[in-house]
Amino acid sequence: TLNSVLNSNAIKNLPPPLGGAAGHPGSAVSAAPGILYPGGNKYQTIDNYQPYPCAEDEECGTDEYCASPTRGGDAGVQICLACRKRRKRCMRHAMCCPGNYCKNGICVSSDQNHFRGEIEETITESFGNDHSTLDGYSRRTTLSSKMYHTKGQEGSVCLRSSDCASGLCCARHFWSKICKPVLKEGQVCTKHRRKGSHGLEIFQRCYCGEGLSCRIQKDHHQASNSSRLHTCQRH
């Protein structure tokens, strides 16, 4: 089961003490069999297993990637998993921890020594799940070394959203990923109805910006399901 497979997942954020302020931010701590936290006059405990469901790597932390934790089990459930360190196996860049990228199925360092001018590298993007590419072959793209030292501007090649400047996200464009603008109010957005469908997009949109959510456009309520337009709207 998911529980047993992922029980090593680190606790993510602690709840506030019972009787504390509602909505009080939790503090990150490391994993332990049961975490003690103050509550009133005695200590309360919280299970260290806190799965975080996701659809895109960008929903996870920078030290995580989004994937189905088991082959065949709990179909459609994707959660944030700890990134893979150097020399660990991978299927796409986001699986590798920051400072590394996926090359020939192994996480390798992306430090300066690996980037003298322009290099060619394999991007093994996973479409829909972690175990397949669109056509079973790797696509090739050119990455610039400077991408690893400055935040990417719009149109820059990226591996993850943290590579992009503020207000941009890393999204698919053909067979690579580039920095694109986070969507503003009124802009068309993609609402993923089917589990894993985001993996099939070759022109991926960013998510809606702060305070906005991707919702059906008012005047499109009567339209057929397939033609309904979603836009970024205020909460």
């Epitope: 680190a10 606790i11 993510k12 954020n13 709840p15 909505g23 009080h24 931010p25 939790g26 990150a28 806190q50 975080y52 469901p53 996701c54 659809a55 895109e56 960008e58 929903e59 996870c60 932390g61 920078t62 030290d63 995580e64 459609g76 459930v77 994707q78 959660i79 944030c80 959203s161 943290s162 503020s166 207000g167 996200c169 986070v182 609402k191 993923h192 109805r193 089917r194 589990k195 894993g196 469908s197 985001h198 998510y207 809606c208 910006g209 702060e210 305070g211 906005l212 959510s213 991707c214």
Partner: nanobody
């Protein structure tokens, strides 16, 4: 100030149903994953169900699969937990938790950083 307010708890007979709601108010952040946890007396607080930002990925703990349904309404900044076929072992205080992030913010590890005060659910046999 951010507030998470749960409602819908109460006393119910075994086999009955309840629908919990949690409204997020205050703050100018985007709500990513949302979850329901529960804590029975003398036990660890455990996750019950969680839903991703887009709603396309949903996690349930084994003991509630097929009985509980989590959903979210982003327009209302609300997360729901529909609980059917309740059992006495479902008796606990239920807490909602969310991941609220400022635009473009991405932590090293994603997690639930805002929590509600809890609502009591008691299932009598």
């Amino acid at each position: 100030e951010v507030q998470l307010v749960e409602s819908g708890g109460g006393l119910v007979q075994a086999g009955g149903s309840l629908r919990l709601s949690c409204v997020v108010s205050g703050g100018t952040f985007s709500v990513y994953a949302m979850a329901w946890f529960r804590q029975a007396p003398g036990k660890l607080r455990e996750i019950v169900a969680a839903i991703s930002r887009t709603g396309s990925s949903i996690y349930y703990t084994d003991s509630v699969k097929g009985r509980f349904t989590i959903s979210r309404d982003d327009a209302k900044k609300t997360v729901y937990l529909q609980m059917n076929s309740l059992k006495s072992e479902d008796t606990a205080v239920y807490y909602c938790a969310v991941d609220g992030r400022a635009n473009g913010e991405r932590p090293a590890v994603a997690g639930y950083n805002y929590w509600g005060q809890g609502t009591q659910v008691t299932v009598s046999s």
